[in-house]
């Protein structure tokens, strides 16, 4: 978890450009900004949701243009724009900053908004680094801003994926060392025994492999069938072998304004009551005018801070502010063991071998268009066609000559002959059967099973 922070320094006419003031002949106005973050590893459609998060600035000071005066840099809202992110920081991202004008004159139906400028940039940025500055042009306007991504403890690292706690806290989790005092950096963990499970094992000394509760074995790969200690956090207690509860992310309830806290792997999530949002439900007094509904949600009600607003979320999003992406793959749309991929704008299935279709619903006809040579027949199954070859041929497509007797099918010294209709075993005295597998009893009757009528010991036996 962490926060992306954006500081707008100035917004005004760019060099050489003197756009008409956004305020001219329109009465009093004020600016506000909206920021949208998308993971930028692949080009995303312009209309795709702000998957990493979005935020809205406060309103800037009211401004009325002085007639005939040159358009200056415009008065800006105070403070940072902060976009909390719950998962790993992706490193490469798309940053979209919109500058909006709110007209405060006597409008029918309340204030009117219009988009003045929109800048979009794909950027590479490590979490925990210094502020990065940028200047972007949008038409005749120029926007100057700085931004950074920072992790929130216990997350650290360039992607906020490693967990750390101060030294004063209980020992860190598996594979993690305590932080040095006042440092946001994890010490490098020791090198554990080769093969030690990354998920279920950890070590405090090089070469060891200690298991988390519920796992056992030299490499912590074996689940323990029952344990009274599962679900507890913290270091092992030498007396009980159980885990002693350590501080958890929801201890002390970090959610403000009556929000309820639930733990997520390595972090927490606040479910906010209506009228509040933000990582810790700390943002309040929100109306529809503040644009609290993310990801294209439609805001209704909430004309003033005392009346609640409701966000109607588009498909794929939920939460009081449409801030949570629905796990659409949980509906298991992919058949036949296909892997569901949520691409943001749509779901796609990656099919196992032998299946096709948008939901892997079609069996592949493995023999379609694939011939078996030399009289072989194609056998379908499991996405890998197989040739059943005629006698004397082998290989994937029956193109290779094969000695049918090479597998030595005749037992007890029987001699193998390739016959046009199959293999034939000529059995040594005292044996019979298709593969000479049955010893013949001294009285001329074979051991079970009985020989078929008409066969005598020593006769060639046809291999089925």
């Amino acid at each position: 978890a962490g926060v992306f922070e954006l500081q707008i320094h100035s917004f005004g006419p760019g060099p050489g450009g003197a756009p008409r003031s956004p305020y001219s002949a329109r009465g009093p106005c004020r600016l506000f900004f909206r920021v949208c973050l998308k993971p930028g590893l692949s080009e995303e459609a312009a209309e795709s949701p702000c998957a990493l998060g979005a935020a809205l600035s406060a309103r800037g000071p009211v401004y009325t243009e002085q007639p005939e005066a040159p358009a200056p840099d415009l008065p800006l809202p105070n403070g940072l724009l902060q976009v909390p992110f719950r998962d790993a920081w992706p490193g490469t991202f798309s940053l979209i900053i919109e500058t909006w004008r709110e007209e405060l004159g006597d409008q029918i139906g309340g204030p009117a908004w219009s988009l003045l400028a929109r800048v979009t940039r794909r950027r590479r940025l490590a979490a925990g680094g210094p502020w990065a500055g940028d200047i972007q042009r949008a038409g005749a306007w120029e926007l100057r801003f700085s931004y950074r991504a920072r992790c929130e403890l216990p997350a650290v690292g360039t992607a906020c994926t490693r967990l750390c706690r101060p030294r004063s806290a209980s020992r860190c989790g598996p594979g993690l060392r305590p932080c040095a005092p006042l440092e946001d950096e994890c010490e490098a963990p020791p090198v554990c025994r080769a093969g030690c499970s990354l998920e279920h094992g950890f070590c405090e000394q090089p070469g060891e492999c200690r298991c988390l509760e519920g796992w056992t074995g030299p490499l912590c790969m074996v689940p323990v069938s029952t344990s009274s200690c599962l679900g507890l956090r913290g270091p092992s207690s030498t007396t009980t072998g159980c885990l002693v509860p350590g501080p958890g992310p929801c201890d002390g309830n970090p959610c403000a304004n009556g929000g309820s806290c639930s733990e997520t792997p390595g972090s927490f999530e606040c479910t906010c009551p209506r009228g509040f949002y933000g990582l810790r439900c700390e943002v309040s007094g929100v109306t529809c005018a503040d644009g609290p509904c993310f990801n294209g949600g439609l805001c209704v009600g909430g004309a003033d801070p005392d009346s609640a607003y409701i966000c109607h979320c588009p498909p794929g999003f939920q939460g009081s502010n449409c801030e949570k992406r629905v796990d659409r793959c949980s509906l298991q749309p992919c058949r036949n063991g296909g892997l569901c991929l949520d691409l943001g704008h749509a779901l796609r299935c990656r099919c196992r071998a032998g299946f096709a279709g948008p939901r892997c619903e079609h069996d592949l006809n493995d023999c379609a268009g694939r011939a078996c040579a030399n009289g072989g027949t194609c056998v379908e199954g499991g996405g890998a066609h197989r040739c059943s070859c005629a006698l004397g041929f082998g290989g994937r497509d029956c193109r290779e000559r094969a000695d049918p007797c090479a597998a030595r099918p005749c037992a007890h010294g029987g001699r193998c002959y390739a016959h046009f209709s199959g293999l034939v075993c000529a059995c040594a005295p005292g044996y019979m059967g298709a593969r000479c597998e049955f010893p013949v009893h001294p009285d001329g009757v074979s051991a079970l099973p009985a020989a078929p009528p008409g066969l005598r010991p020593g006769d060639p036996q046809r291999y089925p």
Epitope: C334, L343, L347, R348, A356, P358, E361, H362, D363, G369
Partner: antibody, heavy 120, light 106 residues
């Protein structure tokens, strides 16, 4: 604009085979499944099978296995269907159609159809 | 195979009326069905996917509904150009199967 242009009507005698084509334009051919559907005179639609130009995967309706053979030529964005051992039962209009490769996608565009008449 | 049943072969209506065409699946297909319109001498045209989502360009008088096994295509304010045969199709399972069609007579 999405367009699926099918080959013209054919009149064939019973016995041999016939191959009909469907040339795709206006979209990325390899991103879509190409389907073939049969419509006998005055009757409903029957799904024959599909081919995925991206990797050549083919799936047939069991009923049409051995009757239809589906192929594609990605260089010309063309799908083909060959019908063999023709009988009067094979007289019908045959449509090619496309379907996207996302979970929600249905068959969305159809060719104009190719009429096949089998008569001695 | 999943059987799609359109019990009414023909339906008669007048311009401006509202008409509902039904389709029943022999087993649960969720909402993985589509509706197609086929005018005389033409190829089918896609109207609805995922039971209730209209393709772009399809007039909003066409509405799809239902899930599981029972589905309906409703045409509000029927127009003369809606004279056609309407087919439902499940694309939940292979082989894809179509209903027998319902001809709308105006």
């Amino acid at each position: 604009e999405v367009h699926l242009q099918q080959s013209g009507p054919v009149l064939v005698k019973p016995g041999p085979s016939v191959k009909i084509s469907c040339k795709a334009s206006g979209f990325t051919f390899t991103d879509y499944y190409m389907h073939w559907v049969k419509q006998s005179h005055g009757k409903s639609l029957e799904w024959i099978g599909l081919v995925y130009p991206y990797n050549g995967d083919i799936s047939y309706n069991q009923k049409f296995k051995g009757k239809a053979t589906l192929t594609v030529d990605t260089s010309s964005s063309t799908a083909y269907m060959e019908l063999n051992s023709l009988t009067s039962e094979d007289s019908a209009v045959y449509y090619c159609a496309r379907q996207g490769n996302y979970v929600n996608n249905a068959i969305d565009y159809w060719g104009q159809g190719t009429s096949v008449t089998v008569s001695s | 195979d999943i059987v799609m049943t359109q019990s009414q072969k023909f339906m008669s209506t007048s311009v401006g009326d509202r008409v509902s065409i039904s389709c029943k699946a022999s087993q649960n297909v969720g909402n993985i069905i589509a509706w197609y319109q086929q005018k005389p001498g033409q190829s089918p045209k896609a109207l609805i996917y995922l039971a209730s989502y209209r393709y772009s360009g399809v007039p909003d008088r066409f509405t799809g509904s239902g899930s599981g096994t029972d589905f309906t295509l409703t045409i509000n304010n029927v127009q003369s150009e809606d004279l056609a045969e309407y087919f439902c199709q499940q694309y939940s399972d292979s082989p894809y199967t179509f209903g027998s069609g319902t001809k709308l007579e105006i």
